[in-house]
């Protein structure tokens, strides 16, 4: 078919025969080769493979292949090797992104923040504040905020409400007589109606681009209140009505129940800036890891809507 034939046509180039001064039209050499001898009135051009360390990407009429770029400077790694058909391409290794001709570590989203946008080899991670009903209890450059464990769905009660930095802590009630047994949908452990679990003071880091107005915005991570409680992945406890007990009160004879480890990469939906988005304007120096400072209250939250 004509179309196929056309697609196989080799381009041509013009060459001036030095001996005769005649302008000749020669066939180009394929990519990965160069013209080692030009055509004459009586002979075709001769193509040779590009020597090691050189390349040609396209069919050509050149007498020498292009030199490959210099070896990748540390900490960059080769994305494409230097070969007859390709120049060497450098990129940043996993966990880093290209910044000012070098590689910088992806920002670590602090406790209370999750990844809104994954980092790539060319773009930094974007962090977001964990929104209502979600939390992040480990600094990470890959994990999103996770929904609180749903204690009620497991026939448990909330012993300690979640914050943006910690999951709900679920437990069992002691056996009550039927007359005192709580009705479904009633929160056994609750906080004042006006208080959101995210309002509970807690220490937290401020990721790059999320500078706090406070002078010392970073904070050290506190150990979990109950180390045996693992991260839950079921959503928030506020689906039941809250009573008026003080936030710090706990019920007598409650038993803590270990939650099974759930998926780690829950995303949060943030509707407004944080609906799922994260840190934007970043300082030139990404956070390489958590910095230590003074404890402070929760950071901001975002209209957040991501989840797995």
């Amino acid at each position: 078919q004509p179309e196929q034939k056309a697609s196989n046509l080799i381009g041509t180039y013009r060459h001036v025969d030095r001996a005769t001064g005649q302008v000749l039209t020669c066939d180009k050499c394929p990519a990965g080769t160069y013209v080692s001898e030009h055509c004459t009135n009586t002979s075709l051009r001769v193509c040779s493979s590009c020597p090691v360390g050189t390349f040609t990407r396209h069919e050509n009429g050149i007498e020498k292949c292009h030199d490959c770029s210099q070896p990748c400077p540390w900490p960059m790694i080769e994305k494409l090797p230097c070969a007859a058909l390709t120049d060497r391409e450098c990129t940043c290794p996993p966990g880093m992104f290209q910044s000012n001709a070098t590689c910088a570590p992806h920002t670590v989203c602090p406790v209370g923040w999750g990844v809104r946008k994954k980092g790539t080899e060319t773009e930094d991670v974007r962090c977001k504040q964990c929104a209502r009903g979600t939390f992040s209890d480990v600094p990470s450059s890959v994990m999103k905020c996770k929904a609180y464990t749903d204690c009620l769905s497991q026939n448990l009660v909330v012993i300690k409400p979640g914050t943006k930095e910690a999951d709900n802590v679920c437990g069992t009630l002691p056996s009550f007589s039927s007359s005192t047994s709580p009705s479904p949908g009633t929160a056994i452990f609750s906080r004042p109606e006006h208080m959101d679990s995210h309002e509970v003071p807690s220490s937290t880091y401020v990721p790059k681009g999320m500078n706090s107005t406070e002078s010392n915005s970073s904070a050290s991570v506190r150990p979990k209140v109950l180390s045996s409680i693992q991260e839950g992945t079921v959503p928030d406890n506020t689906s039941s009505a809250r009573g008026k007990e003080d936030v710090n009160k706990t019920l007598p004879n409650l038993q803590v129940v270990n939650h099974q480890q759930g998926p780690h990469h829950r995303h949060i939906l943030k509707l407004l800036p944080s609906m799922e988005a994260t840190g934007g304007e970043k300082s030139s120096t990404p956070i390489k890891g958590p910095k230590r400072g003074h404890p402070r209250q929760n950071l901001h939250k975002h209209f957040d809507i991501n989840e797995h």
Epitope: A131, G133, T213, S274, D304
Partner: antibody
């Protein structure tokens, strides 16, 4: 009790400017992301812009990018939306909302862009 | 046109069960939490469901949310006259890098 109170709406000509404010009370304002969402007459909700608690990051809908600026003053517990180069299609009730989950909303302020 | 698709209207008689769907894609609902808002006539929207299926305190348990794949649903059981309102779903969109709302569903109690 969480309260958000918008103000600053009104009638403005195309190309004109307005500055909306949202006064917050009943919660620690500086801990929360805040957003603006609008609703044109008889239409649905449209997210406009958001800002982190510290003001460190801002996001804008494509429809307002370059014309609107969101900001906040945590010392005054107030969120702002500076609207420039207003167009007829910006006519709407503008709501401010708290948190990434938009768990609390103000009552809204009407912005009318008309000649 | 909204990134999230909702039916424009739904209706039922008192006591009936009504379901509102919200259809999206992998970049939004498929990979993010879904939120639902109720807007009673002449009032501001109110958070009804967050993180797919959680109710804020004060929201009756007649309202329930669920999510499966790239779609979400809001169910209202035991429909009441006071449930007559507009309902909006919302989520984050990874591709747009922005929050998105559904077009809204007007629920009428017959």
């Amino acid at each position: 009790e969480v309260q958000l109170l918008e103000s600053g709406g009104g009638l403005v000509q195309p190309g004109g400017s307005l500055r909306l404010s949202c006064a917050a009370s009943g919660f620690t304002f500086s801990n929360y992301e805040m957003s603006w969402v609008r609703q044109a007459p008889g239409k649905g909700l449209e997210w406009v812009s958001s800002i982190y608690s510290s003001g460190g990051e801002t996001l804008y809908a494509d429809s307002v990018k370059g014309r609107f600026t969101i900001s906040r003053d945590n010392s005054k517990n107030t969120l702002y939306l500076q609207m420039n180069s207003l167009r007829a299609e910006d006519t709407a009730v503008y709501y401010c909302a708290r948190d990434g989950a938009a768990d609390y909303w103000g009552q809204g302020t009407l912005v009318t862009v008309s000649s | 046109q909204s990134e999230l698709t909702q039916p424009p209207s739904a209706s039922g008689t008192p006591g009936q069960w009504v379901t509102i769907s919200c259809s999206g894609s992998t970049s939004n609902i498929g990979n993010n939490y879904v939120y639902w808002y109720q807007q009673l006539p002449g009032t501001a929207p109110k958070l009804l469901i967050y993180t797919n299926n959680q109710r804020p305190s004060g929201v009756p348990d007649r309202f329930s949310g669920s999510k499966s794949g790239t779609s979400a649903s809001l169910a209202i059981s035991g429909l009441r006259s006071e449930d007559e309102a507009d309902y909006y779903c919302a989520t984050w969109d990874d591709s747009l890098y922005a929050p998105v709302f559904g077009g809204g569903t007007k629920v009428t109690v017959l």
